[in-house]
């Protein structure tokens, strides 16, 4: 489903020609300096070239644009706005290009942009209007269908004095522009929590990847509106238990498959409902691999093999009997 470059016959523009032609208007459909182009595949690759800005002379035919492994730093408003517009650009990959700031309207004037990958950029400043383009309460719908934001968390010392989760969610929800989003990947972002309103406003999601974060609980997250959700990746988080409300919501989604491997499940009395549910459900993929992490006596026990007698909680002693 993802556009790929099956391009053969790439033409490279010779870097030494760049200065010779820069004074003249760009030729239609020429290949930018430091890039490789295939008109047959409608693909432009400007990969690992230490570019500091988006080339201005991108060919109008481009459908798949790879700008990975560069040093772009900032993506300004209208970074891809051209005259005439890049009307066919459908897939844009900016991963690993040292972006730390994406400004409002950075992706405006790309009417066919379906897939955007900003992964592996330390986004200290992601504008709330990066994807919606305007600060209106309801923006024009974004054409985006797939948004890949894996490992965009900046180093701790570079983060603004605000919640990183909040910054990302603000960009996802601004102007309700991303209502058509079907794939959202937010893996490896050190998320501690998922703001409760985010999923309710992304009703078209089919695939949600939250793996390799630090999510401790899903108690306040509602999956109820995600009728079309098919895969929910929650591997490698810090989940201790899933409570009844979450279990019921997941069970109610007709197509959902949930991935829960490598979470530190706490196998005490609070786990009883989840174990019962796991034994009955077909929702969880690889459920036979889920094991307890705590308490120590339960470590590495398989959740599916537990019974209610195994799941006890130490009685809480009244204060007068507690020792320091």
């Amino acid at each position: 489903s993802s556009p790929t470059s099956s391009a053969s016959s790439f033409s490279s523009s010779a870097p030494f020609l760049a200065s010779a032609v820069s004074a003249q208007p760009p030729l239609p459909d020429q290949c930018p300096a430091l890039c490789e182009c295939s008109e047959a595949a409608r693909t432009v690759k400007c990969v690992n070239r230490n570019l500091t800005e988006v080339p201005t002379d991108l060919p109008a035919y481009v459908r798949n644009l790879f700008l990975t492994g560069n040093q772009l730093a900032v993506l300004p408003a209208g970074a891809f706005a051209r005259r005439p517009p890049l009307a066919e650009l459908a897939a844009l990959n900016l991963s690993g290009s040292r972006l730390d700031e994406v400004r409002a309207g950075a992706f405006e004037h790309l009417p066919s942009l379906r897939q955007l990958d900003l992964s592996h950029n330390p986004l200290a400043d992601l504008s709330p209007f990066a994807f919606s383009g305007s600060n209106a309460s309801v923006s024009a719908p974004s054409p985006l269908v797939e948004l890949i934001l894996n490992h965009i968390v900046p180093p701790e010392d570079e983060r603004q004095n605000r919640s990183f989760e909040g910054m990302v969610v603000a960009a996802l929800l601004a102007g309700r522009a991303l209502q058509g989003l079907r794939r959202l990947e937010l893996a490896s972002n050190h998320f501690l929590y998922l703001p409760r309103d985010v999923l309710a406003q992304l009703p078209s999601l089919r695939h949600l990847d939250l793996s390799n974060n630090s999510l401790v609980s899903l108690t306040y997250v509602s999956f109820r509106n995600l009728t079309h959700l098919e895969s929910l990746h929650l591997e490698d988080n810090a989940l201790k238990v899933l409570h009844n409300g979450t279990l019921a919501e997941l069970q109610g989604l007709p197509h959902i498959r949930v991935f829960l491997d490598n979470n530190p499940w706490v196998c005490d009395c609070h786990m009883a409902d989840m174990v019962t549910w796991l034994k009955e459900t077909e929702v969880v993929q690889g459920k036979d691999r889920l094991t307890c992490a705590y308490p120590e006596k339960m470590r590495n026990r398989v959740l599916l093999e537990l019974n209610s007698a195994d799941l006890d909680c130490d009685p809480i002693l009244p204060p007068s009997l507690q020792t320091s």
Partner: antibody, heavy 118, light 113 residues
Framework: EVQLLESGGSLVLPGGSLRLSCAAS????????MSWVRQACGKGLEWVSI???????YYASWAKGRFTISRDNSKNTLYMQMNSLRAEDTALYFC????????????WGQGTLVTVSS | EIVLTQSPSSLSASVGDRVTITCQSS????????LSWYQQKPGKAPKLLIY???TLASGVPSRFSGSGSGTDFTLTISSLQPEDFATYYC?????????????FGQGTKLEIK
Amino acid sequence: EVQLLESGGSLVLPGGSLRLSCAASGFSLSSYWMSWVRQACGKGLEWVSIIAGRGSTYYASWAKGRFTISRDNSKNTLYMQMNSLRAEDTALYFCARVSSIYYTFNLWGQGTLVTVSS
Amino acid sequence: EIVLTQSPSSLSASVGDRVTITCQSSQSVYSNNELSWYQQKPGKAPKLLIYYASTLASGVPSRFSGSGSGTDFTLTISSLQPEDFATYYCQGSYYSGSGWYYAFGQGTKLEIK
């Protein structure tokens, strides 16, 4: 190579039953929605049924109750059980894979011919 | 019952011509965009040309384009090539509380003039 190969089509009497198979190679069937589409000779395409990733099934109104779509993930194979067959079910039956993001048929088999006649 | 109506049912054209085929749905397709176009040649399986109303499938020449939203859609071939003579089908995807439904148009046969 990613491909779909249908089999099981044959000549069958009206009122009879038949099971079509569609073997997938090059990808995991369980990761995709899969569908059956048919085409009578010289006629247009007609959607029959679809099965979602976790097994939910949907049918064209005329196929409900007579046709059953299923799959065996361990065999990477899609099936269509067809009962109470009628002359008007005579057609070439294609299996098709649905995109993981868009609701479109992005991979087709070559079809298997079902003929219902006495 | 959802009906997709293509027009014309058949048309004759010459190499180099610009050709437009329309597809009208009796109900809005899912998300207003879930409309695909396929090309089929005799004895062959259909081939995906356009999905999501206007997105070109991989490997499809750019002389093909799609447009439209909701219930009304168009397939355009900007300059006919000899290999384009075939039958074209639109296909819509629909979702309601009772689940998913798919439908095809009756087809448009494109012949050499």
